[in-house]
């Protein structure tokens, strides 16, 4: 069964900068990736970026740069303008769509104990169902 992993890390040099890494483990080529925060897109979450392998990327503040890392993984850099660093408690969700297989989605957040610069382990937070 395909899976999606989500990893959130705080930059060591700049505590207001965060990076979300997402990857798809499974067969099929990715047609679209949607990244949201505050929950899944369509379920109260806010869209941060949409990445298409051929047509490029579209992003919305506070997303700074969305890019493909491999054919099945992406990264999204975020700039936190607020002093209170709200990203630390935020859930980030990534949805990978593969045709004709379908979509897989998972969410993750920065672990409370994580030190700046240390990446969170890729442990997806299941939403609604374990295979979502």
């Amino acid at each position: 069964t395909p899976e999606v992993w989500v990893q959130v890390q705080m930059e060591a040099t700049e505590l207001s900068s965060f990076t979300v890494h997402c990857g798809f483990l499974g067969p099929g080529s990715i047609s679209l990736v949607t990244v949201s925060w505050g929950g899944p897109d369509g379920a109260g979450g806010t869209k941060l970026a949409v990445l298409h392998p051929e047509l490029g990327t579209r992003q919305w503040a506070p997303a700074r740069q969305a890019r493909w890392e491999t054919q099945s993984s992406i990264s999204l850099a975020l700039e936190d303008s607020g002093a209170s660093s709200p990203f630390a408690n935020t859930t980030f969700c990534c949805k990978f769509a593969s045709f004709p297989e379908g979509s897989w989605e998972s969410c993750g957040s920065l672990p409370p104990s994580s030190d700046p610069g240390l990446s969170a382990p890729p442990t997806p937070v299941p939403i609604l169902r374990a295979d979502l």
Epitope: G28, S29, S31, V50, L55, F99, S103, E105
Partner: antibody, heavy 120, light 107 residues
Framework: DVKLVESGGGLVKLGGSLKLSCAAS????????MSWVRQTPEKRLELVAA????????YYLDTVKGRFTISRDNAKNTLYLQMSSLKSEDTALYYC?????????????WGQGTSVTVSS | SIVMTQTPKFLLVSAGDRVTITCKAS??????VAWYQQKPGQSPKLLMY???NRFTGVPDRFTGSGYGTDFTFTINTVQAEDLAVYFC?????????FGGGTKLEIK
Amino acid sequence: DVKLVESGGGLVKLGGSLKLSCAASGFTFSSYHMSWVRQTPEKRLELVAAINSNVISTYYLDTVKGRFTISRDNAKNTLYLQMSSLKSEDTALYYCARHEDYYGFAMDYWGQGTSVTVSS
Amino acid sequence: SIVMTQTPKFLLVSAGDRVTITCKASQSVSNDVAWYQQKPGQSPKLLMYYVSNRFTGVPDRFTGSGYGTDFTFTINTVQAEDLAVYFCQQAYRSPWTFGGGTKLEIK
């Protein structure tokens, strides 16, 4: 204007074969996933077969696996459905449809359909 | 495969009425739901994608809502030209599956 025109349907004997074609125009055919959807006499819609833009992946409805083959010729802007060992339950109106990545793979354009009738 | 149960099968309404059609998925389909309109003698046409987004040229009297397993499609102020069969469809997991359709008739 996006246009999808199906052809190749007709009356065929039980166990016979047919090849449906769908001529696409008005868009970059090679960039889109395509599928064949049929509408049964009871007006139910079923996704019969689908193929992605780069021809890497295909999907078939369980009841047509091993009998139907979906293919595409991106140079000719044409989608095909080779149907063999036809059964009476394959009688339907067959549509070709385009899938839009940015619309969650919704089928944003459909052809007018071509009718397939399997008789005993 | 995911079953999309659409209700009601038939609707008889007067012009100006508000119409609601529901679709229930047998498992979560996220927000990957589309709605189609099929007028007599025509092929289906896309109305809504990602549950609530109207396709190009679709009037704003058509709206959609829901997430996960329960979805609603509404026509505010039905017009005579809305006479058609309406289908929901999930594109979350292969095989994409359709609801059984709702035939809308105008009194």
